[in-house]
Amino acid sequence: EEELQVIQPDKSVLVAAGETATLRCTATSLIPVGPIQWFRGAGPGRELIYNQKEGHFPRVTTVSDLTKRNNMDFSIRIGNITPADAGTYYCVKFRKGSPDDVEFKSGAGTELSVRAKPSHHHHHH
């Protein structure tokens, strides 16, 4: 059986400030068992954006219903984007472990760029 791959089909996404960003991610297999997490950045300082296993992340919604047992679509939407959200986002599959889950495979990353809202200048005559 082929090993699970984490596919992030979009190398980059451009979103206007105030809009919603969709970051796409799919897994090619249900095995191994374990959660998906999304991070901004890589390495030890990376920022957790969404964790399938724990917590409620008010700005993040999943595109698919992750409670469905055969789901392999782990795409997310992040609402009300600001320039501070710019960066590279990684979809990471974890393998169930004891006591802690173990990072198994990461997607290649999607770079989110934020286009500033056009400012409306009022000209006084």
Epitope: P35, N51, Q52, K53, E54, G55, H56, P58, T61, T62, D65, L66, T67, K68, K96, S98, P99, D100
Partner: antibody, heavy 120, light 107 residues
Framework: EVQLVESGGGVVQPGRSLRLSCAAS????????MIWVRQAPGKGLEWVAS????????YYADSVKGRFTISRDNSKNTLYLQMNSLRAEDTAVYYC?????????????WGQGTMVTVSS | DTQLTQSPSSLSASVGQRVTITCGAS??????MHWYQQKPGKQPKLLIY???NLEAGVPSRFSGSGSGTDFTLTISSLQPEDFATYYC?????????FGQGTKLEIK
Amino acid sequence: EVQLVESGGGVVQPGRSLRLSCAASGFTFSDYGMIWVRQAPGKGLEWVASISSSSSYIYYADSVKGRFTISRDNSKNTLYLQMNSLRAEDTAVYYCARRYYGFNYPFDYWGQGTMVTVSS
Amino acid sequence: DTQLTQSPSSLSASVGQRVTITCGASKSVRTYMHWYQQKPGKQPKLLIYSASNLEAGVPSRFSGSGSGTDFTLTISSLQPEDFATYYCQQSNEPPYTFGQGTKLEIK
């Protein structure tokens, strides 16, 4: 077989404290978020508190915030609810339940409940 | 908070009858609505999760549908063991909330 067994209920005076326990067996406790739900006599279900698998995320109902504390010991497969400053309106059957993975998942197994009566 | 309103609050029906219980949410909960059955003196039991998914071991006469704010639990042909109280519950956002319950009684 999945089992959740609550204990620690009883009769207590208003203002006093009580600690409920929920002993889990038949599944990998550390994989599951856990929840306390209560049911006042003759009433419906009310969510009280929830705790994620590693205790990183904890939520409380407004009605118990600041008075109740949910915790877990994964090495003992046990969930706890520390209830302080108890009020008459806390009188209820308290159920523990498990929730697979994240916040959106349902409560798929429940304990049989333990009765807490707050009365002077 | 997301308020859930079940209808009807109580219902009398006969064995073999088709029964529908509805649950309305005060705002969208997407598909994160679950249904439980509770018999007197017993703990609740999960029937349907995420609007339409039958929990393992639950008879196929139970079904669920809906998304957003309007949800339905249907029992296609009532059996004697189905007389109980049914609750909907949302898990879209904290706090978790339950409907007030629908008591299904034998006619």
